[in-house]
């Protein structure tokens, strides 16, 4: 049940996370399942355990097998299994199916290809990207953080994409490669200047002091997948993250597809325990895409005490 397949190439680094969820700082013991022999934690070993991670620096074909991890506490032991397979490097350019990570699909408006498993490694930009073993060159390809963006995607951009990066461990460098297929969807979509559906511009919302309230910022950006479409709240012209008031939190944006196919995104601003000073703030709903930025402002006002209706959204 708590088992996960992991694979890598000989002479490359491979890092595997314990498939059993724990929390950081808990003791995690790793064992070779077949022999029940404990895996060392000393970093001088080629294969060593480091908390929730098992590191092969570098991996060898003989490392293939099942590894047991146990997240330990005096009252809970959580056991997981990592099924590791290390393959010989292919002499030719062909990447066999068993080395492929999940396929991703893109379109003219949305062509991000994430480098699989990279978050487990200590790497520094830039990533190198290859398609069918050829290094990607030209202004259409942009390596951005842990993903590749392709401008003006066409059907012949479909294929196998390999990311290559260097993992650094205590000053030693190890190569890592990962490959996944990219397919192109033919999508008749379009992008347009953002339209904010809520709130109305210069809207005022009545709230009760001491109660909780939610403000929803919702905007539509066109039809089909959008390359860039974000909504966010600002307080008095500042980002929420720059505004050190833990009572006021912004939820992550959520994509919404409507029956008419519009690509819309919303984000909720949650205000706990509304205070008088919150009524003095300007709340800006910002919608941004490649066409530009639109802003709607909403303010809070104290609810008339005679009106006893609930103010929850």
């Amino acid at each position: 049940k708590f088992s996960k397949q992991s694979w890598g190439l000989e002479n490359e680094a491979l890092i595997v996370r314990c498939p059993r969820q724990g929390k950081s700082s808990y003791i995690v013991d790793w064992y070779y399942s077949q022999t029940n022999k404990s895996i060392p934690t000393q970093e001088r070993n080629r294969v060593f355990a480091s908390g929730q991670l098992l590191k092969f620096l570098p991996a060898e074909v003989a490392d293939s097998g099942i590894y047991t991890c146990i997240v330990r506490s005096p009252t809970f032991n959580r056991t997981g299994y990592a099924n590791v397979t290390i393959y010989k490097k292919q002499p030719d350019c062909n990447v066999p199916d068993y080395l492929m990570y999940s396929t991703v699909s893109g379109s003219e408006k949305n062509s991000k290809i994430y480098c699989p498993t990279i978050d487990l490694y200590n790497w520094t930009a830039p990533l190198e990207w290859f398609k069918n073993c050829q290094a990607l060159q030209g202004s259409r390809y942009k390596a951005h953080k842990s993903f590749l963006v392709i401008d003006n995607v066409m059907t012949d951009d479909a294929g196998d994409y390999t990311c290559k990066f260097i993992h650094n461990e205590n000053g030693a460098n190890y190569s890592v490669t990962a490959t996944r297929s990219f397919t192109v969807k033919d999508e008749q979509g379009f992008s347009r200047f953002p339209v904010i559906r809520a709130p109305a511009h210069n809207e005022t919302k009545e709230v009760e002091i001491g109660e909780n309230t939610n403000l929803t910022c919702s905007a539509c950006f066109g039809k089909g997948a959008q390359f860039l479409a974000t909504v966010q709240w600002q307080l008095n012209g500042n980002k929420i993250t720059d505004f050190s008031e833990p009572r006021i939190q912004q939820e992550e944006g959520q994509n919404q597809s409507f029956s008419n196919g519009l690509a819309c995104v919303n984000t909720v601003l949650r205000i706990a325990d509304v205070k008088e000073e919150d009524l003095l703030l300007r709340y800006d709903c910002l919608a941004l895409n490649l066409h530009g930025l639109r802003r709607h402002t909403i303010r809070l006002s104290r609810k008339n005490p005679i009106d006893h209706q609930s103010t929850y959204c």
């Epitope: 929390k23 808990y26 506490s73 009252t75 959580r78």
Partner: antibody, heavy 117, light 111 residues
Framework: DVQLQQSGPGLVKPSQSLSLTCTVT?????????WNWIRQFPGNKLEWMGY???????TYNPSLKSRFSITRDTSKNQFFLQLNSVTTEDTATYYC??????????WGQGTSVTVSS | DIVLTQSPASLAVSLGQRATISCRAS??????????MHWYQQKPGQPPKLLIY???NLESGVPARFSGSGSGTDFTLNINPMEEEDAATYYC?????????FGSGTKLEIK
């Protein structure tokens, strides 16, 4: 995100049984974690009552002897508290909570239960 | 059962100042270099909320002004600087053995 929603009666007569339900959304109770019941007496003292883990195995606080049990309905993603032969001493706010490992990470909203004739 | 004794029972601290809450266990809750003590915050009408696990690890989303320390039988929760929304009751809980037990709580108010 894991969310726990509690339901059950607010008033129970002495010597009767108390039954409460905790409905979990955002996570399957058979995937992992332990699913606890905790109560808070008037005066705010908290007492851990026990848990049922993802596999259905239970662990109880010995202070509740054999009066207490936790069961589950995996098809509805719910787990239940049953406390038999209640007395006025069982008047409390009852919480369900989930445990990733050791600590109580997510809590239900609480159900206030009064034992009175 | 391991008994957890919190002190003080109540505490008033000025905004911007440090609040310190203690929790003493009747026997050690540490083993293998880890301390199995956790801290919660509870506001009226709400369930407790996890702040710190394993004595000193900040739960995700909890502000950095909260910190925990200690090992063996003596543990401390610090809030620095005290903010208005920190007025609440704070509880310690151990998971060294069954049954888990909680401290009696410390009510923190604004001076």
């Amino acid at each position: 995100d894991v969310q726990l929603q509690q339901s059950g009666p607010g008033l129970v007569k002495p010597s009767q049984s108390l039954s409460l339900t905790c409905t979990v959304t955002g996570y399957s109770i058979t995937s992992d974690y332990a699913w606890n019941w905790i109560r808070q007496f008037p005066g705010n003292k908290l007492e851990w009552m026990g848990y049922i883990d993802y596999s259905g195995s239970t662990t109880y606080n010995p202070s509740l002897k054999s009066r207490f049990s936790i069961t589950r309905d995996t098809s509805k993603n719910q787990f239940f508290l049953q406390l038999n032969s209640v007395t006025t001493e069982d008047t409390a706010t009852y919480y369900c909570a989930s445990t990733v490992i050791d600590s109580m990470d997510y809590w239900g909203q609480g159900t206030s239960v009064t034992v009175s004739s | 059962d391991i008994v957890l004794t919190q002190s003080p029972a109540s505490l008033a601290v000025s905004l911007g100042q440090r609040a310190t809450i203690s929790c003493r266990a009747s026997k050690s809750v540490s083993t293998s270099g880890h301390s199995y003590m956790h801290w919660y915050q509870q506001k009226p009408g709400q369930p407790p909320k996890l702040l710190i696990y394993l004595a000193s690890n900040l739960e995700s989303g909890v502000p950095a002004r909260f910190s925990g320390s200690g090992s063996g039988t003596d543990f401390t929760l610090n809030i620095n600087p005290m903010e208005e929304e920190d007025a609440a009751t704070y509880y310690c809980q151990h998971s060294r053995e069954f049954p888990f037990t909680f401290g009696s709580g410390t009510k923190l108010e604004i001076k």
